[in-house]
Interface confidence: medium
Amino acid sequence: DEGKASSAKQRLKCASLQKFGERAFKAWAVARLSQRFPKAEFAEVSKLVTDLTKVHTECCHGDLLECADDRADLAKYICENQDSISSKLKECCEKPLLEKSHCIAEVENDEMPADLPSLAADFVESKDVCKNYAEAKDVFLGMFLYEYARRHPDYSVVLLLRLAKTYETTLEKCCAAADPHECYAKVFDEFKP
């Protein structure tokens, strides 16, 4: 039964990757991994997302050898760097190779770090929001998604992606306005459930 569920999940991921494309898959992965590994830094999560996307692309294209190799490499990397990723990986990383990847994929969310600062300072109040967004849009939006997701393990990934999309749309509109800050100052109010 567990094997069937895992296989169904994989088929769903392949369908999503094919239908929505790599950028959307990466956004989904940033949100999910940030919830699962809230103590990991953004650069670490981004590396995992890049590697995970490569694994899924190969698996979905039927490149089964590359898929298996890269999946094993990713599990190895995660286990070698578990101190900077999550405190919940110990048991998974002690399992034999074939069980390791599946265990990591199902691992519970780590505890959120204490005293995470408010997001408003960097994503609303900073005078450089539009400059930062223009400089590296996907990285800035990725950071926003990471920071929001790690603070909200209770939110669905779909909701997190919707919030990130709202933020992106707001910046696209407001950064072209006469007074950008005035325009996006209330963006977080739109996020209230």
Partner: nanobody, 128 residues
Framework: QLQVVESGGGLVQAGGSLRLSCAAS????????MGWFRQAPEKEREFVAG?????????DYADSVEGRFTISRDNAKNTAYLQMNNLKPEDTAVYYC????????????????????WGHGTQVTVSS
């Protein structure tokens, strides 16, 4: 692991110039502040200069290098630079590049603890 690699060190006469480069292996590093530190023999590692990665590029310098050293970055190349002019013998040290893990708006810190990713260093020797 995520890599940070310095280059450009060497031997130079007092009054001369050098330009150090710091290449980061991941595009995501454009999101982080970055700093240069140095360590002379028998001395503690010390802050030299820092820059925020994003546009706005807040910069910060140690008093001992202000006006002589300039930190800059090229996001397209994932690279930061330290232009060192009017070098003095007391600038002799191993120079380390480090990437912070602060949020993008954060100023580049002077505290070593706010930097997660470090290079192995490049030697700068200034002869009199």
């Amino acid at each position: 692991q995520l890599q940070v690699v310095e280059s450009g060190g060497g031997l130079v006469q007092a009054g001369g110039s050098l330009r150090l480069s710091c290449a980061a292996s991941e595009r995501t590093f454009v999101a982080y502040p970055m700093g240069w530190f140095r360590q002379a023999p028998e001395k503690e590692r010390e802050f030299v200069a820092g820059i925020s990665w994003f546009a706005g590029a807040t910069t910060d310098y140690a008093d001992s290098v202000e006006g002589r050293f300039t930190i800059s970055r090229d996001n397209a190349k994932n690279t930061a630079y330290l232009q060192m002019n009017n070098l003095k013998p007391e600038d002799t040290a191993v120079y380390y590049c480090a990437i912070s893990h602060q949020l993008p708006g954060g100023r580049p810190g002077r505290d070593m603890d706010s930097y997660s990713y470090w290079g192995h260093g490049t030697q700068v020797t200034v002869s009199s």
